[in-house]
């Protein structure tokens, strides 16, 4: 396994939607055909992942239909949106690109996104 | 026992089609990059095409770009290569090839070990 | 494309004899080189992965060394069965590319 340098934003602030995009940028040094994009969500000493996606380069990403994940895809760029978040899901989101094939098999963790969610204030009842 | 079996080849007119076939069984077909390797009569070993497990990805050689369509079918274990627009230097046996991967903390291991008996596709008039 | 050059094309030996085929890439290619062996009218078998690692099975006389551009194959004790075309192939870049071949008879 080889070392690969992934760069991502430090800070982001989700919508008042619940939607957070960044990009996710590594540096290829290697001319890999499929690589694997997977975001990790670390909080509280715990890491899970919230989804993962293979693609082709200079295809697009396709994240299971069931994913809060989609994103595009540009050389060596990930852009990546999360959606459907709420303010407990405020944490550490990191960047993990493989370069899958053909080989070297590369690597590459970022440092991660910290993305902020503040849950929208309910609006007043009405009387109109 | 792992196996992998083609069908599909023939004798085909320039200019026509064929679809190969590669049955494979004993292995957890999903998890394999597979491959299309040819052999012109007499000849060296030709690399063709490659498909990822997911098929999500695929990669061809020059020669049979936009002619040949690799894909598979993983709940029917088959690989498929669609062959249009077929010249006489297509003329080979064509074998599918799958691509092992070992995966350890430290490597990743490639190589084509696990190989079809070939199908003979002949293009002449 | 990377060319793999492969040499020689053919070649005649006794029994006992020790066998030595070369292989050069066109660039560098690490070590992610494969030696292939393949008998009259059948498939291919991988012998050698990652330019000098033995495959499971295969008799301990075939070795492999190399990287970079410059790759050996040996075997060191020529057998009857041993009779075959031998590949290489690089295994990096695409297009996946193979040696053209070397031919091993018996004398």
């Known amino acids: 396994c080889k070392a690969m340098h992934v760069a991502q934003p430090a800070v982001v602030l989700a919508s008042s939607r619940g939607i957070a995009s960044f990009v996710c940028e590594y540096a290829s040094p290697g001319k890999a055909t499929e690589v694997r994009v997977t975001v990790l969500r670390q909080a509280d000493s715990q890491v899970t992942e919230v989804c993962a996606a293979t693609y082709m380069m200079g295809n697009e990403l396709t994240f299971l239909d069931d994913s809060i994940c989609t994103g595009t895809s540009s050389g060596n760029q990930v852009n990546l949106t999360i959606q459907g978040l709420r303010a407990m899901d405020t944490g550490l989101y990191i960047c993990k690109v493989e370069l899958m094939y053909p080989p070297p098999y590369y690597l590459g963790i970022g440092n991660g996104t910290q993305i902020y969610v503040i849950d929208p204030e309910p609006c007043p009842d009405s009387d109109f | 026992e792992v196996q992998l079996v083609e069908s599909g080849g023939g004798l085909v007119q320039p200019g026509g089609s064929l679809r190969l076939s590669c049955a494979a069984s004993?292995?957890?077909?999903?998890?394999?990059?597979m491959h299309w390797v040819r052999q012109a009569p007499g000849k060296g070993l030709e690399w063709v095409s490659y498909?990822?497990?997911?098929?999500?990805?695929?990669y061809y050689a020059d020669s049979v770009k936009g002619r040949f369509t690799i894909s598979r079918d993983n709940s029917k274990n088959t690989l498929y290569l669609q062959m249009n627009s077929l010249r006489a230097e297509d003329t080979a046996v064509y074998y599918c090839?799958?691509?092992?991967?070992?995966?350890?903390?430290?490597?990743?291991?490639?190589?084509?070990?696990?190989w079809g008996q070939g199908t003979l596709v002949t293009v002449s008039s | 494309d990377i060319q793999m050059t492969q040499s020689p094309s053919s070649l005649s030996a006794s029994v006992g004899d020790r066998v030595t085929i070369t292989c050069q890439a066109s660039?560098?290619?690490?070590?992610?080189l494969n030696w292939y062996q393949q008998k009259p009218g059948k498939a291919p078998k991988l012998l050698i992965y990652?330019?000098?690692n033995l495959e499971t099975g295969v008799p301990s006389r075939f070795s492999g060394s190399g990287s970079g551009t410059d790759f050996t194959f040996t075997i060191s004790s020529l057998q009857p069965e041993d009779i075959a075309t031998y590949y290489c192939?690089?295994?990096?870049?695409?297009?996946?590319?193979f040696g053209q071949g070397t031919k091993v008879e018996i004398k």
């Open positions: 192939q690089q295994h990096t870049n695409f297009p996946f590319t």
């Open positions: 498909i990822s497990g997911s098929g999500s990805s695929t």
């Open positions: 990652d330019a000098s």
């Open positions: 090839a799958r691509d092992r991967m070992l995966v350890d903390s430290v490597n990743r291991v490639f190589g084509f070990d696990v």
């Open positions: 660039q560098d290619i690490s070590n992610y």
């Open positions: 004993g292995f957890t077909f999903s998890s394999y990059y």
